[in-house]
Interface confidence: medium
């Protein structure tokens, strides 16, 4: 028995169905066929659960968060023993383990191993602005999405003719910042977030208005 | 680090039966074989049996079937071996073994073995 | 069952010497064996597995060779700790069987 080798890892978008591959060969008839399927989930690597179990000719339910949603690809018994699960939540990102038992085959690798990474697109970020928009002073744009797997860079653009920032600023994609040092009313106008990641992108908008001294009267 | 902790020496009657425990830890212990392999003194090795834990069904030797049953706690991370109907050559020391990586067959981490002596 | 062959039975070397074990199988076991160490009062060691495949913190003098029903086991340079019995083992067919040994003795 030889569990074939699996793709390192598999990424599917939150919602999506994902199919985690496991096929083996042997020698033997599958009378006697077991297969557990297990995971360690990322967000609780200390607690593997059961996913789905093939034993004795007939099919077992895992752990209740996957009722419903999870299933073998093929009819069993079958040398393919991959799954499907439907929806796919944030929570089902980890290691996914096939373990195949398929007496009297002695067997030499009987696990196979893949990693499951569920996406999240960049949900609406929050634009804001950070200090005083005072003529000369300096002021921070800050833009951040609660949501978002692998974590979202984030890009500003001036929403000018030509969509640059003032020569004055700074950026940090990472961070989602921008950094304008003595801002002059030349800052003025619409700024918007880009915040991306591999499998989406989301916007928001901010409304920077340098406020210019008021003359002083003289009399 | 793995560890396989046997239980103490046991001296027993013909015709009674022992049971040997070995208390897995350090690793994942229902994924990976569990063979018991005894040694006669003086003599070489010999594979009686084993268990995959998390399947819960046991492989045996032909020469040991019906004399000898290999069973798993998972809760525990215990795994044991009862040989019934003992005679005096069943002395040896019973060692528990845990396969190479995935596999039924190679052993990359033995218990401390465990001395039965069969004696009236 | 497929039985193992061992020889010789025993030897006596002097460490830095080159040694060979031979383990020959009753029928093919393809490349699906292993070569343990055991030394008195303990467990055994998997040294070799898959014929050729050195276990973890194996010391490279020990190397395995060969397929089918012809095993070597060698040591290129015999070290003061590695006198002791060593036994081959196939995991190709049920039951799992062990050679009957062979003994690396001090000369």
């Known amino acids: 028995l030889e569990v074939s080798e699996s793709p390192g890892s598999i990424q599917v978008a939150r919602g999506q169905p994902a199919v985690l591959p496991c096929t083996f060969t042997t020698s033997a008839a599958l009378i006697n066929l077991n297969v557990i399927w297990m995971v360690t989930p990322l967000s609780n690597a200390n607690q593997p659960e059961q996913v789905i179990l093939y034993q004795g000719g007939q099919m077992f339910d895992g752990a209740p968060r996957f009722h419903g949603r999870v299933g073998f690809t093929g009819t069993m018994p079958a040398t393919n023993v991959s799954i499907f699960i439907n929806n796919t939540q944030l929570s089902d990102t980890g290691t996914y383990q096939c373990l195949v038992n398929n007496l009297p085959d002695i067997g030499g690798r009987n696990i196979g191993v893949t990693g499951l990474t569920v996406l999240v697109p960049p949900s609406a970020p929050h634009c804001q602005i950070q200090g005083s928009q005072d003529i000369g002073s300096d002021v921070i744009l800050l833009c951040s999405s609660e949501e978002g797997i692998p974590r979202p860079t984030y890009l500003w653009e001036k929403l000018d003719n030509t969509l640059k920032l003032p020569p004055t600023a700074t950026q940090d994609q990472v961070q989602g910042t921008v950094t304008i040092r003595n801002i002059s009313a030349l800052s003025s106008g619409l700024y918007q977030c880009v915040a991306s990641n591999a499998i989406g992108t989301s916007t928001c908008l901010l409304d920077l208005q340098v406020i210019s001294p008021q003359p002083r009267n003289i009399g | 680090q793995v560890q396989l902790v046997q239980s103490g020496a046991e001296v027993k009657k013909p015709g009674s039966s022992v049971k040997v425990s070995c208390k897995a830890s350090g690793g994942t212990f229902s994924s990976y074989a569990i063979s018991w392999v005894r040694q006669a003194p003086g003599q070489g090795l010999e594979w009686m049996g084993g268990i995959i834990p998390i399947f819960g069904t046991a492989n045996y030797a032909q020469k040991f079937q019906g004399r000898v049953t290999i069973t798993a706690d998972k809760s525990t991370s215990t795994a044991y071996m009862e040989l019934s109907s003992l005679r005096s050559e069943d002395t040896a020391v019973y060692y528990c073994?845990?396969?190479?990586?995935?596999?039924?067959?190679?052993?990359?981490?033995w218990g401390q073995g465990t001395l039965v002596t069969v004696s009236s | 069952e497929i039985v193992l062959t061992q020889s010789p039975a025993s030897l006596s070397l002097s460490p830095g010497e080159r040694v060979t074990l031979s383990c020959r199988a009753s029928q093919s076991v393809s490349n699906y064996l292993a070569w343990y160490q055991q030394k008195p009062g303990q467990a055994p060691r998997l040294l070799i597995y898959?014929?050729?495949n050195r276990a973890t913190g194996i010391p490279a003098r020990f190397s395995g060779s060969g397929s089918g029903t012809d095993f070597t086991l060698t040591i290129s340079s015999l070290e003061p700790e590695d006198f002791a019995v060593y036994y081959c083992?196939?995991?190709?067919?049920?039951?799992?069987?062990f050679g009957g040994g062979t003994k690396v003795e001090i000369k």
């Open positions: 073994a845990r396969a190479r990586g995935s596999t039924w067959g190679y052993f990359d981490y």
């Open positions: 083992q196939q995991r190709d067919n049920w039951p799992l069987t």
């Open positions: 898959d014929a050729s």
